[in-house]
């Protein structure tokens, strides 16, 4: 098997399968490049965030160039050895979401609740519509909490 000079790096292996495996890879001359050998593909150095291998690495030791992910459609936010970028998240209107920060080559889309929608969990995959009050509002709907409504028959001072 191929060997290499010492490498010590925190990398993410998205390994052409789209799987994220964070690891510290340490290799020394005459040792196997543990973590760099995947499915018969052999990579010496990872691509930086925002890029991917132009093609899969091969056992013969030639090192494919890194090429950029498709801006606004794909990203990679960590160094990795994959020939694929991750696709950008779509902020799905049907789940009550809208774009807060657009996807870049190095960062996935950030979503937030649409106006008049809220989400009370820490990671929002779905936002619910704010309740419309029939008898008046105690507390307005926010991004993280639903409207609090007055009950029927309650009086305001």
């Amino acid at each position: 098997r191929l060997s290499s000079k010492s490498v010590n790096a925190q990398v993410t292996d998205i390994n052409s399968k789209g799987l994220e495996l964070r690891k510290t890879v340490t290799t020394v001359e005459t040792q196997n490049l543990e973590g760099l050998h995947h499915d018969g593909q052999f990579c010496h150095k990872p691509c930086p965030p925002g890029e991917r291998k132009a093609r899969d690495c091969t056992v013969n030791g030639d090192e494919p160039d890194c090429v950029p992910c498709q801006e606004g459609k794909e990203y990679t936010d960590k160094a990795h050895f994959s020939s694929k970028c991750r696709r950008c998240r779509l902020c799905d209107e049907g789940h009550g979401l809208e774009v807060e920060i657009n996807c870049t080559r190095t960062q996935n889309t950030k979503c937030r609740c649409k106006p008049n929608f809220f989400c009370n969990s820490t990671v929002c995959e779905h936002c619910d519509p704010c309740t419309k009050c029939e008898h008046g509002i105690i507390k307005e709907c926010t991004l993280t909490s639903n409207t609090k409504c007055k009950e029927e028959g309650s009086r305001s001072n």
Epitope: K17, G18, L19, K73, R89, D92, E93, N108, E125, H126
Partner: antibody, heavy 121, light 111 residues
Framework: QVQLVQSGAEVKKPGASVKVSCKAS????????MQWVRQAPGQGLEWMGE????????NYNQKFKGKATLTVDTSTSTAYMELSSLRSEDTAVYYC??????????????WGQGTLVTVSS | DIVLTQSPSSLSASVGDRVTITCKAS??????????MNWYQQKPGKAPKLLIY???NLESGIPSRFSGSGSGTDFTLTISSLQPEDFATYYC?????????FGQGTKVEIK
């Protein structure tokens, strides 16, 4: 309600091309990617590719690159899939489906009724 | 490509039975803690219909007797009490990696 209505069945000769349409209604067409899936007679489902109607960006299954071409007409909320150089193996039902995203998991929530394309000499 | 293998390929069951269909992926379809697996139902001559997305989320309008579970490489679709309208073919589908792939299908027939 959300609906995808596809064009009718087609019979084509080998070597010909065919263009299948998929008209969307009941939602904002440019807000959701459109997916295309094929199903050969008696077989399972096979993903062909997708198109973002907001900018016509396409992403194909490598197997269908050069075989299928995806386009949209936003003025009529219609997606199209053209198949070229038809062979008997292309005989299948072709479906369009609306794409949804739940935390980066893409799935197909509404499907067209399917268009049968038969390739026969 | 990620290969999805469903089992069984077909099964015979009676109305009221609990039915379990499994889908095994050739490699993990999880990413950042999320499972990228969906389930569809298809009846003869009809388009597929979404049942479950992201492994365990029930699509709006689908009866609660359908449920999904699993992570990594092993996923399950369960019908808690089979109804006459549930006799159909069921497909799993992964969306973690392109090309997106489907299982070969599981046909649920009347015993």
């Amino acid at each position: 309600q959300v609906q995808l209505v596809q064009s009718g069945a087609e019979v084509k000769k080998p070597g010909a091309s065919v263009k299948v349409s998929c008209k969307a209604s009941g939602y904002t067409f440019t807000s959701y990617w459109m997916q295309w899936v094929r199903q050969a007679p008696g077989q399972g489902l096979e993903w062909m590719g997708e198109i973002d109607p907001s900018d016509s960006y396409t992403n194909y299954n490598q197997k269908f690159k050069g075989k299928a071409t995806l386009t949209v007409d936003t003025s009529t909320s219609t997606a199209y899939m053209e198949l070229s150089s038809l062979r008997s193996e292309d005989t299948a039902v072709y479906y369009c489906a609306r794409n949804r995203d739940y935390s980066n998991n893409w799935y197909f929530d509404v499907w067209g009724q399917g268009t049968l394309v038969t390739v026969s000499s | 490509d990620i290969v999805l293998t469903q089992s069984p390929s077909s099964l015979s069951a009676s109305v009221g039975d609990r039915v379990t269909i499994t889908c095994k992926a050739s490699q993990s379809v999880d990413y950042d803690g999320d499972s990228y697996m969906n389930w569809y139902q298809q009846k003869p001559g009809k388009a597929p219909k979404l049942l479950i997305y992201a492994a365990s989320n029930l699509e709006s309008g689908i009866p609660s007797r359908f449920s999904g579970s699993g992570s990594g490489t092993d996923f399950t679709l369960t019908i808690s009490s089979l109804q006459p309208e549930d006799f159909a073919t069921y497909y799993c589908q992964q969306s973690n990696e392109d090309p997106r792939t489907f299982g070969q299908g599981t046909k649920v027939e009347i015993k």
